[in-house]
Amino acid sequence: QPQGLSGMQGEPSLGDSSSGEDELGVDVLPSEEDAPEEADPPDGEDPPEVNSEDRMEESLGLEDLSTPEAPEHSQGSHGDEKGGGHSHWSYGGTLLWPQVSPACAGRFQSPVDIRLERTAFCRTLQPLELLGYELQPLPELSLSNNGHTVQLTLPPGLKMALGPGQEYRALQLHLHWGTSDHPGSEHTVNGHRFPAEIHVVHLSTAFSELHEALGRPGGLAVLAAFLQESPEENSAYEQLLSHLEEISEEGSKIEIPGLDVSALLPSDLSRYYRYEGSLTTPPCSQGVIWTVFNETVKLSAKQLHTLSVSLWGPRDSRLQLNFRATQPLNGRTIEASFPAAEDSSPEPVHVNSCFTAGD
């Protein structure tokens, strides 16, 4: 591999690594609630309206705001540039994704709506272990705007274990967001959409390269956390957000100082939701093990605004609302590492439905 990018240095941003988190739950003050984008088939397991949960709606003080899922005016081509075998796609043309990649029409897709009362408490889901995520300023890392998101490419050495014998290495992280007045997380909780979401993508150590793992059960694992507004600035995220202006143009790439990647995630790695799904962008490969943390990460309003207005995508349009509609569960069970269901008994339920990567 060629060495070093010249003339692409980023300025270091000092600050502590506290990410500032909050628990999901009825005390969360949401910015907005969305109706479900794609209801599950009426097979008795997933009612079509998550906002029909009156108890949840009342306790959160939510209104049933049915909002557009991914506006057709959002950035990017709509899959119409087929010359030369192009596979361009956009968040405004998600119905065309199966034409770009047939896997996008698969039965076990991501993201999903996490309905707390339908999660299965699984005692075997242990706290995640992260090793080597506290990076030093050198070597520097590549931060890029690929027209769909902001991506931080991670170096070798960041190791994560979902459980015994289920080891992964981090490849990259990226974010999903909305606009200043519309939240943009990919996963939702009881129909509630959060302002933004971080994904840290990992490759199973059972595979040496990404292409081998795509579509294989447990080949990839993604750690996801919701970003939420709070009064304080998040110093860890500022080390990313402070550089967005430098990569405002699609295709831009810079080098920024290494940072503590674990500080971008919640501090409580023991309480999370787990299910098997897919990549949320084409090629939508399935077999991806998703871990969605219960704690949210707190960013200031200014930081969330910076995230939503700093980047540009194709055709001189703002890079915003870069989230996919939630997908049907189609019989999947979402496991929880803690009793997440409001009416759950102290004893674990559906213990036999717990799975391990690669099952």
Epitope: N146, E209, L210, E250
Partner: nanobody, 117 residues
Framework: QVQLVESGGGLVQPGGSLRLSCSAS???????????VAWYRQAPGKGLELVSV???????KYSDSVKGRFTISRDNSKNTLYLQMNSLRAEDTAVYYC????????WGQGTLVTVSS
């Protein structure tokens, strides 16, 4: 194993043209189509410089030094990336590398372009 093989380099006079190709072989078809693909170059004794990129969203970007002279294109049906280089100058002399970025970075071994009279 994904392999990126560059070709098309060589010796050319100032003002001349070359067309570089980068073919992705191996089991990579399901990656190339969805990746951001780019050309980088490294001049003797210099650092790595981004020449041009086509993002996964379809946008293109060029470094100021090649804008208006170089054209990047891709053919996903052939898993191939191209760089058409016109009006070549001595300062374009470098090893040119192909890069495929989809969750993971893939690099070619490089092809040498020498612009000299």
């Amino acid at each position: 194993q994904v392999q990126l093989v560059e070709s098309g380099g060589g010796l050319v006079q100032p003002g001349g043209s070359l067309r570089l190709s980068c073919s992705a072989s191996g089991n990579s078809a399901n990656i190339f189509s969805f990746a951001s693909v780019a050309w980088y170059r490294q001049a003797p004794g210099k650092g790595l410089e981004l020449v041009s990129v086509i993002t996964s969203a379809g946008g293109t970007k060029y470094s100021d030094s090649v804008k208006g002279r170089f054209t990047i294109s891709r053919d996903n049906s052939k898993n191939t990336l191209y760089l058409q280089m016109n009006s070549l100058r001595a300062e374009d002399t470098a090893v040119y590398y192909c890069n495929v970025d989809y969750l993971q970075d893939y690099w070619g071994q490089g092809t040498l372009v020498t612009v000299s009279s």
